[in-house]
């Protein structure tokens, strides 16, 4: 099985009440604008076939996609939360920059690609949905990486 290295985040990243609250507030505001409740981006399908030791690497991919392809294009919306949450998530992404797995990661890339395709297919409403799931992104990152 692939071995992951440097795929760890310090628990203290998730023990900051202020930024945690802002992240959840941003998610709540965006999810109230999401009218497609049948689709969930961060759920069982995303992690299917991914071992415990690979979960953080997968979440790194999801985090980077969310930052680059979702939050930056929508950066003028959902203020003032967005301007505080984006730098926080960017710091987490930077902390995971050396996280990789040795060996085949094709199964992980396939799962992440399905999430990307879903967001792209839904267009702007897909981006809103992804922002509405930032609470799940935050918690999944925490659970996979600490």
């Amino acid at each position: 099985a692939p071995v992951s290295s440097h795929c760890r985040l310090d628990k203290s990243n998730f023990q900051q009440p202020y930024i945690t609250n802002r992240t959840f507030m941003l998610a709540k505001e965006a999810s109230s604008a999401d009218n497609n409740t049948d689709v969930r981006l961060i759920g069982e399908k995303l992690f299917r076939g991914v071992s415990m030791s690979e979960r953080c690497y997968l979440m790194k991919q999801v985090l980077n996609f969310t930052l680059e392809e979702v939050l930056l294009p929508q950066s003028d919306r959902f203020q003032p939360y967005m301007q505080e949450v984006v730098p926080f998530l960017a710091r987490l992404s930077n902390s995971l920059s050396t996280c990789h797995i040795e060996g085949d990661d094709l199964h992980i890339q396939k799962n992440v690609q399905k999430l990307k395709d879903t967001v792209k297919k839904l267009g702007e409403s897909g981006e809103i949905k992804a922002i509405g799931e930032l609470d799940l992104l935050f918690m999944s990152l925490r659970n996979a990486c600490i």
């Epitope: 628990k11 998730f14 759920g43 076939g49 071992s51 415990m52 799940l136 918690m139 659970n143 996979a144």
Partner: antibody, heavy 116, light 112 residues
Framework: QSVEESGGRLVTPGTPLTLTCTVS????????MIWVRQAPGEGLEWIGI?????STYYASWAKGRFTISRTSTTVDLKITSPTTGDTATYFC?????????????WGPGTLVTVSS | AVVLTQTASPVSAPVGGTVTIKCQAS??????LAWYQQKPGQPPKLLIY???TLASGVPSRFKGSGSGTEFTLTISDLECADAATYYC??????????????FGGGTEVVVK
């Protein structure tokens, strides 16, 4: 998608016993599996888990007392040296990670009685 | 290891009534909490995860809430079929895997 346990029976203390969990409708290459037990009239107690890559993790109290292994369609739980305190219904369940681990579905359970 | 303390059994209410079951964690578990229903002679059944997300096929009469150390399962419009024992279950990450999954002691619900 279902799981079913088998192999539970009456055994004497110290006699090793292997329970088998057979899965259908999904692949063990996609999901981790857990074992949980429940003594008569008591609550649920996590024993251990076997991951997709075959890695195993046990509750601290269960280390050395149980061994989990698997084939392509079954997951085994070996009780290495049963004592009367191991009398319980043993359940296996699929671990669905959705960002947090959740256990669904569960098998109906298999009863192990340890008595001299 | 985290300890989950549930409302003492039994909790009773009439058909059509409401019951509330509490689950207290000995440390902060964020929203890493699930609820399971178990009827006599049957395996547990997943009801709620992420503290408040309803599992597939579970009626909206079941509602989970809470985060951190205090969690609640509320069952409204009680039916006879809701008579069961309810368990909370926590996932704790970042520590040793030997204490990752913990169950509460269970709370029996009696429907009168």
């Amino acid at each position: 998608q279902s799981v079913e346990e088998s192999g539970g029976r009456l055994v004497t203390p110290g006699t090793p016993l292997t329970l088998t969990c057979t899965v259908s409708g999904f692949s063990l290459s996609s999901y981790a599996m857990i074992w949980v037990r429940q003594a008569p009239g008591e609550g649920l107690e996590w024993i251990g888990i076997i991951d997709i890559d075959g890695s195993t993790y046990y509750a601290s109290w269960a280390k050395g007392r149980f061994t989990i292994s698997r084939t392509s369609t079954t997951v085994d739980l070996k009780i290495t040296s049963p004592t009367t305190g191991d009398t319980a219904t043993y359940f296996c369940a699929r671990d669905r990670f959705v960002g947090v681990d959740i256990f669904d579905p569960w098998g109906p359970g298999t009863l192990v009685t340890v008595s001299s | 290891a985290v300890v989950l303390t549930q409302t003492a059994s039994p909790v009773s209410a009439p058909v059509g009534g409401t019951v509330t079951i509490k689950c207290q964690a000995s440390e902060d578990i964020y929203t890493n909490l699930a609820w399971y229903q178990q009827k006599p002679g049957q395996p547990p059944k997943l009801l709620i995860y992420w503290a408040s997300t309803l599992a597939s096929g579970v009626p909206s009469r079941f509602k989970g809430s809470g985060s951190g150390t205090e969690f609640t399962l509320t069952i409204s419009d009680l039916e006879c079929a809701d008579a069961a024992t309810y368990y909370c279950q926590a996932c704790v990450y970042g520590n040793s895997a030997d204490s990752r999954y913990t169950f509460g002691g269970g709370t029996e619900v009696v429907v009168k």
